[in-house]
Interface confidence: low
């Protein structure tokens, strides 16, 4: 259904408030360094133009594509070359190359100051003084730091952010009411950003087929009562939504997501019995709720998979006639029977099945050749099961902080070339798998753990892609999306690594560490731990533990001292010397 004016179409579908918010997100995700005021000005200009097109779709320029309109607007920024360097060259290109060029310059780790949370009273005053600007600033700050954040979901976060301030700024104890809510939004927001980043990486690096396979597996687990044709339709629509959002087409994405939610709710009887509550909510909450809905119960008496996919004499005929459809059916049937498997495991099984059929359907006796294909699945299933069991035992024994430290050491030894901040960030997140997943019963552990690890390892991959330093990371990140985790698990100590020169400055600490939050203090200690391993990759657990225990005691002692700075200077020298001796440096 072609519209004379795409911008008018989207403005009418989404409404002015959502239109403005989504354009702001889009611009902030493209031009991540531009000041807030500049973006607001651009958004207002686009909005005014959109209104003229709503009034008269035949007006000048109203027939232009959204990419053309938005790109032209971004290219009016006067400081583009000084601020963004070669990104300014994008403006010399025509659409669609110009948009592709902007997409390639999105920065997963922009050089922006850390967001510091002001005092509660200061925030409440700002909220009351100008609620609209306050909420726009939230969208802007999140979008520029997370250039792939799922835009319609960010509108949902902004709605919750507004609700938190509306409620808590009237409360007797504003801080007690507001701070936990903001912490929750921050943590959920980081998780949401990372999950969406994996979806975009899947689409951009491995293609639509890889994303669709992921979606078939996940939706089949979630909606096991839905028929294959229904799941296929949802997968097609969901792929369109995420392709649009990952491609910067945020207005189309939000519009299509709303349509998909509407379709799901209108057809919930043939999709899932768990959707009723979600479908009673307003649009943003509804879409979020559907995305997070629990798995429906599996239909009773599902027949054995072997009948259709191993025992049948028509396997090769069915495969040859429509390979992707047949493999999609295999994945659907396997996934709906296995909510206890991770999506990536299901995809590995499907890949193994595909590989076997490719080989066997060309063999003299295909049936004999693929008869034992399900036997090949056993080690693939056992590998993540064993890994999760071992790591949950370790987590329960150590607790989260020490478990993170064990992973820090493990990953620094595997890929010591990776920057220390990246190793700390990624290992801390990997370590959170313990508290997130190990509490679950066996049947929920693997989907929780391995699919979460896929998200975290993707963070490592996108950060490493910006500044590649390790061939091993590149190999694990680029060879196979579903085998990233096993690839990293299989890495041993990098024997080719030349230890870093010892630099006492790295291990010099000051009194400011005493005023840090517990989390920030942990990060300081974990940064030191990574550096230690980089200096002495062959250090034993016992040696590292001894040095870290000394370090903890040193910080505790100096933070209690009257003259903290002198204590840090003098005791620090002793600690460095003792650590060097302990590690044989």
């Amino acid at each position: 259904d072609a519209h004379k004016s795409e911008v008018a179409h989207r403005f009418k579908d989404l409404g002015e408030e959502n239109f403005k918010a989504l354009v702001l997100i889009a611009f902030a995700q493209y031009l991540q360094q531009c000041p807030f005021e500049d973006h607001v000005k651009l958004v207002n200009e686009v909005t005014e133009f959109a209104k003229t097109c709503v009034a008269d779709e035949s007006a000048e320029n109203c027939d232009k594509s959204l990419h053309t309109l938005f790109g032209d607007k971004l290219c009016t920024v006067a400081t583009l070359r000084e601020t963004y360097g070669e990104m300014a060259d994008c403006c010399a290109k025509q659409e669609p190359e110009r948009n592709e060029c902007f997409l390639q310059h999105k920065d997963d780790n922009p050089n922006l100051p850390r967001l510091v949370r002001p005092e509660v009273d200061v925030m409440c005053t700002a909220f009351h003084d100008n609620e609209e600007t306050f909420l726009k600033k939230y969208l802007y700050e999140i979008a520029r730091r997370h250039p792939y954040f799922y835009a319609p979901e960010l509108l949902f976060f902004a709605k919750r952010y507004k609700a938190a301030f509306t409620e808590c700024c009237q409360a007797a104890d504003k801080a007690a009411c507001l701070l936990p809510k903001l912490d929750e939004l921050r943590d959920e927001g980081k998780a949401s950003s990372a999950k969406q980043r994996l979806k975009c990486a899947s689409l951009q690096k491995f293609g639509e087929r890889a994303f669709k396979a992921w979606a078939v597996a996940r939706l089949s687990q979630r909606f096991p009562k839905a028929e294959f044709a229904e799941v296929s339709k949802l997968v097609t629509d969901l792929t369109k939504v995420h392709t649009e959002c990952c491609h910067g087409d945020l207005l189309e994405c939000a519009d299509d997501r709303a349509d998909l939610a509407k379709y799901i709710c209108e057809n919930q009887d043939s999709i899932s019995s768990k959707l009723k509550e979600c479908c009673e909510k307003p649009l943003l909450e509804k879409s979020h709720c559907i995305a997070e809905v629990e798995n429906d119960e599996m239909p009773a008496d599902l027949p054995s998979l072997a009948a259709d996919f191993v025992e049948s004499k028509d396997v090769c005929k069915n495969y040859a006639e429509a390979k992707d459809v047949f493999l999609g059916m295999f994945l659907y049937e396997y996934a709906r029977r296995h909510p206890d498997y991770s999506v990536v495991l299901l995809l590995r099984l499907a890949k193994t099945y595909e590989t076997t059929l490719e080989k066997c359907c060309a063999a003299a006796d295909p049936h004999e050749c693929y008869a034992k294909v399900f036997d090949e699945f056993k080690p693939l299933v056992e590998e993540p099961q064993n890994l999760i069991k071992q790591n949950c035992e370790l987590f329960e024994q150590l607790g989260e902080y020490k478990f993170q430290n064990a992973l820090l050491v493990r990953y620094t030894k595997k890929v010591p070339q990776v920057s220390t901040p990246t190793l700390v960030e990624v290992s801390r997140n990997l370590g959170k798998v313990g508290s997130k997943c190990c509490k679950h019963p066996e049947a929920k552990r693997m989907p929780c753990a391995e699919d979460y690890l896929s998200v975290v390892l993707n963070q490592l991959c996108v950060l490493h892609e910006k500044t590649p330093v390790s061939d091993r990371v590149t190999k694990c990140c680029t060879e196979s999306l579903v085998n990233r985790r096993p690839c990293f698990s299989a890495l041993e100590v990098d024997e080719t690594y030349v230890p870093k020169e010892f630099n006492a400055e790295t291990f010099t600490f000051h009194a400011d560490i005493c005023t840090l939050s517990e989390k920030e203090r942990q990060i300081k200690k974990q940064t030191a731990l990574v550096e230690l391993v980089k200096h002495k990759p062959k250090a034993t657990k016992e040696q590292l533990k001894a040095v870290m225990d000394d370090f903890a005691a040193f910080v505790e002692k100096c933070c209690k001292a009257d003259d903290k700075e002198t204590c840090f200077a003098e005791e620090g020298k002793k600690l460095v010397a003792a650590s060097q001796a302990a590690l044989g440096l």
Partner: antibody, heavy 120, light 110 residues
Framework: EVQLVESGGGLVQPGGSLRLSCAVS????????MTWVRQAPGKGLEWIGT?????NTNYANWAKGRFTISKDSTTVYLQMNSLRAEDTAVYYC????????????????WGQGTLVTVSS | DIVMTQSPSTLSASVGDRVTITCQAS??????LAWYQQKPGKAPKLLIY???TVASGVPSRFKGSGSGTEFTLTISSLQPDDFATYYC????????????FGGGTKVEIK
């Protein structure tokens, strides 16, 4: 120590059979695919076949029917039947990819090879 | 089946020379290509995998490049230990021939 040791080579008459063994140590066959490769005197490398972690086999077209790969917990075997003079070669076993790669991978670890001579 | 064509079959060079060996696949294999070095009477040794990734313990003078059907192994400055035969190998499990080796390139002293 991670290593592969081939054995079972020797002189065999045309039309005869031979079974080569590849003993592995330092890793588990349930986690790695194993491949047999041969090299005729003065010639290049030639892939024979591969056995996956689950025991499925994949052969070069020329090897199908005469060559069979199997394994137990620590050893990989190559059964060669109806041998011909042109099968004279050094036979190597090599370790392929980690279990979770459904695809084939590079051969990162090789045995020292065992010589098979087919002659009357 | 995939056929790997390696050239040249023999190459005469001196210590310090920059040496280039090429390998052509009969159909696209993405980046699924490995390079091996073999010395007389010894087993092959993995040098490069995934077209450009240098294997553990291999000197940095060895460099792999290419994707699709055209691949290159470059030795930036030939050392005495580098005189050997080099093989390329595709590994594509989706084809009926999982592994296909090139014919080899013998690098000898000029």
């Amino acid at each position: 120590e991670v290593q592969l040791v081939e054995s079972g080579g020797g002189l065999v008459q045309p039309g005869g059979s031979l079974r080569l063994s590849c003993a592995v140590s330092g890793f588990s066959l349930s986690r790695y695919a194993m491949t047999w490769v041969r090299q005729a005197p003065g010639k290049g490398l030639e892939w024979i076949g591969t056995i996956t972690t689950g025991g499925n086999t994949n052969y070069a077209n020329w090897a199908k029917g005469r060559f069979t790969i199997s394994k137990d917990s620590t050893t990989v075997y190559l059964q060669m039947n109806s041998l011909r003079a042109e099968d004279t070669a050094v036979y190597y076993c090599a370790r392929g990819g980690y279990v979770s790669y459904a695809d084939a991978t590079e051969l990162s670890l090789w045995g020292q090879g065992t010589l098979v001579t087919v002659s009357s | 089946d995939i056929v790997m064509t390696q050239s040249p079959s023999t190459l005469s060079a001196s210590v310090g020379d920059r040496v280039t060996i090429t390998c052509q696949a009969s159909q696209s294999i993405g980046s699924r290509l490995a390079w091996y070095q073999q010395k007389p009477g010894k087993a092959p040794k993995l040098l490069i995998y995934y077209a450009s990734t240098v294997a553990s313990g291999v000197p940095s003078r060895f460099k792999g490049s290419g994707s699709g059907t055209e691949f290159t192994l470059t030795i930036s400055s030939l050392q005495p230990d580098d005189f050997a035969t080099y093989y390329c190998q595709s590994y594509d499990y989706s084809s009926s021939s999982s592994y296909a080796f090139g014919g080899g390139t013998k690098v000898e002293i000029k």
